[in-house]
Interface confidence: low
Amino acid sequence: GAPEGGQPYPVLRVAHSAPVGAQLATELSIAEGQEVLFGVFVTGKDGGPGVGPNSVVCAFPIDLLDTLIDEGVERCCESPVHPGLRRGLDFFQSPSFCPNPPGLEALSPNTSCRHFPLLVSSSFSRVDLFNGLLGPVQVTALYVTRLDNVTVAHMGTMDGRILQVELVRSLNYLLYVSNFSLGDSGQPVQRDVSRLGDHLLFASGDQVFQVPIQGPGCRHFLTCGRCLRAWHFMGCGWCGNMCGQQKECPGSWQQDHCPPKLTEFHPHSGPLRGSTRLTLCGSNFYLHPSGLVPEGTHQVTVGQSPCRPLPKDSSKLRPVPRKDFVEEFECELEPLGTQAVGPTNVSLTVTNMPPGKHFRVDGTSVLRGFSFMEPVLIAVQPLFGPRAGGTCLTLEGQSLSVGTSRAVLVNGTECLLARVSEGQLLCATPPGATVASVPLSLQVGGAQVPGSWTFQYREDPVVLSISPNCGYINSHITICGQHLTSAWHLVLSFHDGLRAVESRCERQLPEQQLCRLPEYVVRDPQGWVAGNLSARGDGAAGFTLPGFRFLPPPHPPSANLVPLKPEEHAIKFEYIGLGAVADCVGINVTVGGESCQHEFRGDMVVCPLPPSLQLGQDGAPLQVCVDGECHILGRVVRPGPDGVPQST
Amino acid sequence: EDWQCPRTPYAASRDFDVKYVVPSFSAGGLVQAMVTYEGDRNESAVFVAIRNRLHVLGPDLKSVQSLATGPAGDPGCQTCAACGPGPHGPPGDTDTKVLVLDPALPALVSCGSSLQGRCFLHDLEPQGTAVHLAAPACLFSAHHNRPDDCPDCVASPLGTRVTVVEQGQASYFYVASSLDAAVAASFSPRSVSIRRLKADASGFAPGFVALSVLPKHLVSYSIEYVHSFHTGAFVYFLTVQPASVTDDPSALHTRLARLSATEPELGDYRELVLDCRFAP
């Protein structure tokens, strides 16, 4: 009876006492049929929640209540009495200490301690039978009945619903007989409930409702399995496609078997030639937790083709979570020669199953949506790569993702699949033994996809040098080496110690490739970032140039006229960042097509005019070429004395 | 590829939005009390009280009889008329506070908020599978009742719970009422009492045993009686009340009060605190 931990729910909202069924009696450690007081408690008068559920239900066995009261009387009235133990009930009587009667100093010989009202000093503590599962529900009415060996709480709620729930402590979900709305008014169900025969009477607003003790019906059970697992007293049976009581569908009502129910399957397509491992999902497949299927009981057909049941892989067996149910069934589909391409049905028939605890499985379930398809391989690229492997092959075609298995074989060795889609497969080639042309094939579902393809293993590319040792976004890099064209693309990557960026080189010569630096943002426009610049060809060994300087790109000024004073023989213009990249890329400055021996002073470029240069009436164009990319910055003109341009 | 079936939530096997239509009765006003009767000869009834009216329904929830229980002072009040002519108290609506069966007779007893909380006894008359109420008897003897001692003042307008117990040939009414200072001053109902129904159905025997909230606590200490029942040798009341007479009156807890069902006395009145918790 001592208080335990947990959140107190001190305010009783409704109560009812009733004898309990065998199962709950066992859980409460009392005898079946013993009277138990059930109370719905809330946290306060307003019933508003703190944390935790709105309503909780506690069970107090009457015999235990009486024992606690009798023990409390003993503590008050039998020697030795604990000093300071109060009789209590000070709102009814004068305060006093045990064993004295109210208001008196001490007992007189003709009065007994037991003959006066008493508040027992200890409380009777219990925890929520429903483990908080009533959640937001605010219970406003309660009546408890025993049905067979089951104890059922019939509860009315604040929003005008009736919940009929088995009272059981050991579960972490609610076992509902029913949960339904009394009407559309949504008014609270009132506290007092009465029983009349096999019905309970609940009041809500100005209405009285008569609810069968065994529940209002079975239509809220949506699946045959759930229907036939319902309590016997509910009288539920399966009526072909709904759960009902016998009077609702006397012609089709039965309680002995459920058909299997297919809800989903995977995959939704398979190859016309070759096998597919089909996974069927649903319920009422075998009713055995181990997933064992008795011989010859389950027949799966897809279109005209049989699907051979497979034993369940024990490593893949997963416990079905408390609030979920799903069954899986696997079979191997090998299409018949007569099977046609196109959409078809998946059908599961279960027969001759031994009866389960609640029913046996018997019947057929059909689901549309499987398609037989013919994979077609249209293109493969590249058809060559280094002996080291690692070439990313792209196979293009149709229906390449059908079924459950596919393999790209290069000279009989699997090419590791990186990506699979309906129209494209990506895989990385395995290493080759020698430089040679070898067969390349695609298998789907173990059957070869038509088409004859050859892959050429070439000598591994060898990178010997990378130059220059600096650059900026998209600036050119030269790679020198041997067999550089063996790879479909050389990949250039820059790594700053934190992240890497990559670009692909266009194929040119076996000994030399011209590449562009990848996109990389140098945050500080005045600075640069040092890192490693690497070049590699597919799976072959690469080459790394350490200490590569990645610079911000130079910014050309806007184009305009460049006027010269009479005494000037050199042009000065600003070109931010150009001086910094002068060691990394080729820079050429021309005026009127003639090259000038430019020099840098910070961000200023000084270009001495060539002696042979003739500036005409319109001047001459000033052009700067950086890494092969040319910009006309303006026209060089020499104004006359009155400011009008004139020729020299 | 290791594809797994998506799990189906357990809740997907049930639909609690399915509409069920169950038999119902429209009482014409907010239902204040309801009690059922099942006789030995397959006769049964449902009694439904609303303000100023008592409905008698058959087992099919069809109306069999309807009785006006108020307003007090209104010439149409059928129960009031059973107390004879003359004004019996201030006029006003009758809200039914007690509706119980006395299984010994058998009879229905109803007590309301008007006429000092007095009760009326309606003998049950079986008619086939249905039941009718005989003319009501007024359980009030004017010469026995005073404002400071009123054995026939049973119902409190603040709420009353009654359990009827047969002891020998007599019916004892175990009554628990919520009080405040104003209610206590008017024909002095008690918090807890045991009253014997007089054999001539003229009211309750005087000199009944009772406990009441002491006058000094009436303002701050209110007891709500939530439920009462009889099992074995005891009658039990369930209350919600302040945890202490001295501390914050809004700090409530729940108690069970136990009374002897075999001896109509209150010396062995016991209370026990019921503690219900949620342990996540």
Partner: antibody, heavy 116, light 108 residues
Framework: EVKLEQSGGGLVQPGGSRKLSCAAS????????MHWVRQAPEKGLEWVAY????????YYADTVKGRFTISRDNPKNTLFLQMTSLRSEDTAIYYC?????????WGQGTTLTVSS | DIVLTQTPSSMYAFLGERVTIICKAS??????LNWVQQKPGKAPKTLIY???RLADGVPSRFSGSGSGQDYSLTISSLEYEDMGIYYC??????????FGSGTKLEIK
């Protein structure tokens, strides 16, 4: 075309009340559960409440339990969120979203500001 | 309650780049995971449900994968319109349904 049109936002004082609405069209409203999700300024998404198609099941986040009530009027294809005892931390954009677990369509959002 | 931890909290990526966002659950959530996109100033939009199923009208460059506690959203080739915040959402154990804290994706 599935559409969820929201209304009812605005400025409310702390301790005040407000009712948000979400009018649905383009699908069978009573067949789908509905959610409310909110987003406080410069914060992430926070789930608030859920109600099933026929109002038989509802869930609330602990932060709003006892203060907010989710309801729906199926004949009028409308979802509601009644908010009481509002606090400054309830300031957010409130979105309604369709379906039980797969929140496949979302409303445009309505802004609630709780401030004195 | 189940906690979803998203990484990174923000990232920059180039157009055309392959982008992957990670979502880790505090316990096994049995593939009951959605990915939701929210573009600046707009309402959220569901991209992926049940960990790897593409929602209606979502471009095929988006894909989801994972199992147990670890899930990822991949954009195979980033486009400008993919800029926004991406949230994961679990519905294995509820209430409550819980969202990840979000990953802000910006274009370099």
């Amino acid at each position: 075309e599935v559409k969820l049109e929201q209304s009812g936002g605005g400025l409310v004082q702390p301790g005040g009340s407000r009712k948000l609405s979400c009018a649905a069209s383009g699908f069978t409203f009573s067949s789908f559960g509905m959610h409310w999700v909110r987003q406080a300024p410069e914060k992430g998404l926070e789930w608030v409440a859920y109600i099933s198609g026929g109002s038989g099941t509802f869930y609330y986040a602990d932060t709003v339990k006892g203060r907010f009530t989710i309801s729906r009027d199926n004949p009028k294809n409308t979802l509601f969120l009644q908010m009481t005892s509002l606090r400054s931390e309830d300031t957010a954009i409130y979105y309604c979203a369709r379906s039980t677990t797969v929140l496949d369509y979302w409303g445009q959002g309505t802004t609630l500001t709780v401030s004195s | 309650d189940i906690v979803l931890t998203q990484t990174p909290s923000s990232m920059y990526a180039f157009l055309g780049e392959r982008v992957t966002i990670i979502c880790k659950a505090s316990q096994d959530i049995n593939n009951y995971l959605n990915w939701v996109q929210q573009k600046p100033g707009k309402a959220p939009k569901t991209l992926i449900y049940h960990a790897d199923r593409l929602a209606d009208g979502v471009p095929s460059r988006f894909s989801g994968s994972g199992s147990g506690q670890d899930y990822s959203l991949t954009i195979s080739s980033l486009e400008y319109e993919d800029m926004g915040i991406y949230y994961c959402l679990q519905y294995d154990d509820f209430p409550p349904f819980t969202f990840g804290s979000g990953t802000k994706l910006e274009i370099k």
